[in-house]
């Protein structure tokens, strides 16, 4: 990778300047696509900010950009005007250029912000040169709010600054009035005034009457050293405009503005709702607007005025519907900074906000909300609720339109029916069960983002706190013991201080769950079970008769049990015990305790019993070590001798 270009950027004070290929140009020996030449901002600017023309200019600082985006002029540096005057300021950006597999290259971009530069959007080289409005035949003070050269002083090191001043030399005097300093008129023999006199409010313009034509004066400003000595330093020659207004003139009153809302890539007329003024003594055609700063999401155009952007228009253009905003592909909001004048009063700043609406929004639901059973609550995340349109909508607001039946939503521990995407992203929105009679719930929300809404249903399920056996296959035709090695809700018991209960909802398809008689004295056969407890599992009182799939050749099969698990003070949960089965294999060590094996296997072993043994298992079968796991079928027989 190599980096060409000047790596310096000259920026006018308070302006936006795009980075260009003259400033920053990366290339690689492999001729890499500029899209793949990636800059990472290691240290951002201190005097302004870097942002992307197509993205939110008010959002977070830019972190990455590509050489292609530099070529397109989409990477912008904006200088932010400081409160204190300056003549020249320097900023730096530290960047890292990367394009694997090449080694990264570090780069520093130097930014010079200077009043010396010729700036079309800031024609004056002074800190302020705003001009003056004066009523006809009257006087007005020219203060540093209108004319201020303190940025020239800022070029002097601060210890010596107090000994310096700025000398203004009037090179062309006002034609319709006169300038006075401390009530003394300026004239060709005495054409000077100082920045210090301006700052002290000693400069006055007195209008001579006889009309409201424009007036003004030209001047040259330069630094003056101690005792009035001329010193080398910045200087400028400029004009100061003086507008004379009719004494009876009432200034226009801007009216409250409603933001313009439109979808991206579309066009919308601007009406009086966006731009209007009350001015009884001016016609709409006399009220002029000028664009001081335009947003990046589109431009203003006049019907019949060509396709390009306009920077000047009148209230008459607005009132007649001739002015429109044309949105580009950007999806971010923006603001026009305008100045408005009736030609006789000082220009007033106005703004026009443009909000780019999504044509539609969608609530993305990636997964149901899973609530851990022992907690009974869970935080919502972007997995459950996230609004997207033409971009992600971080400002989305949600309102419950149908609440959950078995719980409620809380923010900060308080029940709530309204919350934001930000609160979801922060993990602050919690669903908590309040009624522990259902293993699932749902609620419906209405999402609102930038004036568009959409609804969605969030499903809630409870995740059982249950350890489920996940071993190898079980033998068809056998009865195996259901104990905590197969199903264990012991942790749920500890967490709730209760004995968890199971209810069989479904399955197995081939087989059944039975209660095993404790001893020979108990009445014979196994009883079918639909409900049991953790205690039953721990006591070894339960068996699972593993059936053979009917109507097909013997072979491996799959089966499952669906259970509902209940405990005190927590919602119930549905869990599955999925298991594989296979024809019984005497030589195979099964990892569960078998209470009986298929009849055919027993007959082969020379044990002429026709009934399935359902009595109490022998010591081996009931020990923690599974019986058949020890040594195949003979060991099983030994273990079950006494039954």
């Amino acid at each position: 990778l190599s980096l060409k270009g000047s790596q310096t950027l000259t920026v006018c004070p308070g302006s936006v300047q795009p980075l260009s290929s003259q400033t920053l140009r990366a290339s690689s020996s492999a001729g890499t696509d500029p899209q793949l030449l990636l800059y990472r901002v290691v240290r951002g600017p201190q005097l302004g900010r870097l942002f992307h023309a197509q993205q939110d200019s008010t959002g977070e600082a830019l972190v990455n950009f590509t050489q292609a985006e530099v070529y397109a002029g989409n990477i912008l540096y904006e200088h932010e005007m400081p409160p204190e005057p300056f003549w020249e300021a320097h900023d730096t950006l530290e960047l890292q250029l990367s394009s694997p597999p090449a080694r990264d290259v570090a780069a520093t971009l130097a930014v010079a912000v200077s009043f010396e530069a010729a700036c079309p959007q800031h024609p004056s080289h002074l800190w302020k040169n705003k001009g003056l409005w004066v009523p006809e035949g009257q006087r007005a003070r020219i203060t540093v709010a209108a004319l201020d050269a303190s940025n020239l002083l800022a070029s002097v090191p601060s210890p010596q600054r107090s000994e310096h001043d700025v000398l203004f030399q009037v090179t062309q005097f006002p034609s319709r009035g006169q300038l006075l300093v401390s009530e003394e008129p300026l004239h060709a023999g005495q054409p000077h005034f100082l920045q210090s006199q301006l700052a002290a409010g000693q400069l006055v313009y007195a209008h001579g009457g006889g009309g409201t034509q424009q007036d003004g004066f030209h001047f040259r400003a330069h630094l003056q050293g101690p005792a009035g000595a001329s010193v080398a330093g910045p200087q400028t020659s400029e004009a100061f405009a003086i507008t004379v207004r009719d004494v009876n003139e009432r200034p226009p009153q801007p009216q409250a503005s409603v933001p313009l809302r439109l979808t991206r890539g579309s066009r919308a007329p601007i009406s009086r709702a966006q731009l209007s003024v009350v001015d009884p003594d001016s016609a709409p055609g006399e009220i002029e607007y000028e664009v001081q700063r335009a947003p990046h999401n589109g431009f203003l155009s006049l019907v019949g005025g060509g396709l390009g952007p306009v920077t000047r228009f009148t209230q008459a253009d607005v009132d007649s519907g001739r002015l429109a905003f044309v949105a580009n592909g950007s999806s971010v909001a923006g603001i026009f900074q305008l100045s408005m004048s009736d030609g006789a009063s000082p220009p007033l700043p106005m703004s026009l906000a443009v909000d780019i609406l999504p044509s539609a929004i969608e609530v993305q639901l990636r997964a149901p909300l899973e609530v851990p059973q022992a907690l009974g609550r869970s935080s919502l995340s972007q997995q459950q609720l996230r609004v997207v349109s033409d971009r992600e909508e971080p400002e989305a607001a949600y309102r419950l339109i149908q609440g959950p039946q078995y719980g409620h939503l809380l923010v900060g521990g308080r029940p709530t029916s309204a919350f934001s995407q930000f609160q979801i992203d922060q993990g602050e929105v919690v669903f908590a069960f309040t009624n522990f009679s259902s293993s699932h719930d749902h609620f419906r929300v209405l999402a609102l983002a930038r004036g568009v809404n959409a609804s969605a249903v969030v499903n809630v399920t409870v995740r059982a706190l249950l350890h489920v056996w996940a071993g190898g296959p079980w033998p068809q035709g056998a009865t195996l013991r259901l104990d905590p090695t197969v199903l264990d809700a012991g942790e749920l018991a500890n967490r709730t201080g209760s004995v968890p209960r199971f209810r069989l909802l479904e399955g197995p398809r081939h087989g059944r769950v039975v209660r095993v008689p404790r001893a020979r004295t108990e009445p014979g056969g196994s009883q079918l079970v639909e409900q049991f407890t953790q205690q039953d599992l721990e006591d070894g009182r339960l068996g699972l008769e593993v059936g053979r799939p009917e109507g097909r050749a013997p072979g491996p099969a799959g089966d499952s049990l669906t259970l509902e698990l209940w405990a005190q003070g927590v919602p119930p949960a549905v869990a599955s015990l999925d298991f594989a089965t296979e024809p019984y294999n005497a030589a195979r060590p099964y990892s569960v305790a078998l209470l009986s094996v298929p009849e055919a296997a027993r007959t082969e072993a020379g044990k002429p019993e026709s009934s399935t043994p359902t009595g109490e298992p022998g010591p081996m079968a009931s020990s923690p070590e599974p019986a058949v796991a020890k040594g195949g079928f003979l060991s099983f027989l030994e273990a079950n001798m006494f039954s």
Epitope: I401, R414, S417, A432, T434, N435
Partner: antibody, heavy 112, light 107 residues
């Protein structure tokens, strides 16, 4: 800040239906989550009667469920309590509340 | 139903004392606990919600703590206006239930 105000008769005859209304100001009953009725027998603790939510769904205390109905009128921003077949044991101060804020309470005496 | 048991049922204390009231739930309530203050003839006022969050406008001398089944309301330095009855209430499981109340009296 939400304010709640109970209204209704202070005396109800045994076996009749107690009816109270709560008027909410400073907030909408379609935006707050729970709108509760709670009562307090003289010199005793608090007993939750039931609630109606922002979307109109209800939940009642099982001990009173067969006799309680809570409804709402969104146009008036009010919610109401009806307790049927009252006895002297239903004599209490009845409060409406959203848990953050409570009405000042109204004493209902059941007596012939 | 979840039973809420407050202790003590009453206590006597002086201005400036540190006072602690406990509330025990018959089973875990996940922190969903409110504390209210009630003065004679008045409605209860929320002091603390979600175990330890101070309601707006409540003086910082009130604090709450606890988890699982055991919860505490502490008044760090009792003021004359704090003499009242205090109630705890759970909103973890329906029906919502209250403790029987603790009366704080002047010694």
């Amino acid at each position: 800040q939400v304010q709640l105000q109970e209204s209704g008769p202070g005396l109800v005859k045994p076996s009749q239906t107690l009816s109270l209304t709560c008027t909410v100001s400073g907030g909408s009953i379609t935006s707050g989550y729970y709108w509760n009725w709670i009562r307090q027998h003289p010199g005793k603790g608090l007993e939750w009667i039931g609630y109606i939510t922002y979307d109109g769904s209800n939940n009642y205390n099982p001990s009173l469920k067969s006799r309680v109905t809570i409804s709402r009128d969104t146009s008036k921003n009010q919610f109401s309590l009806k307790l049927s077949s009252v006895t002297a044991a239903d004599t209490a101060v009845y409060y409406c509340a959203d848990f953050d804020y409570w009405g000042q309470g109204t004493l209902v005496t059941v007596s012939s | 139903d979840i039973q809420m048991t407050q202790s003590p049922s009453s206590l006597s204390a002086s201005v400036g004392d540190r006072v602690t009231i406990t509330c025990r739930a018959s089973y875990g309530i996940r922190g969903y606990l409110n504390w209210y203050q009630q003065k004679p003839g008045k409605a209860p006022k929320l002091l603390i919600y979600y175990t330890s969050s101070l309601h707006s406008g409540v003086p910082s001398r009130f604090s709450g703590s606890g988890s699982g089944t055991d919860f505490t309301l502490t008044i760090s330095s009792l003021q004359p206006e704090d003499f009242a009855t205090y109630h705890c209430q759970q909103y973890s499981a329906l029906p919502w239930t209250f403790g029987q109340g603790t009366k704080v009296e002047i010694k």
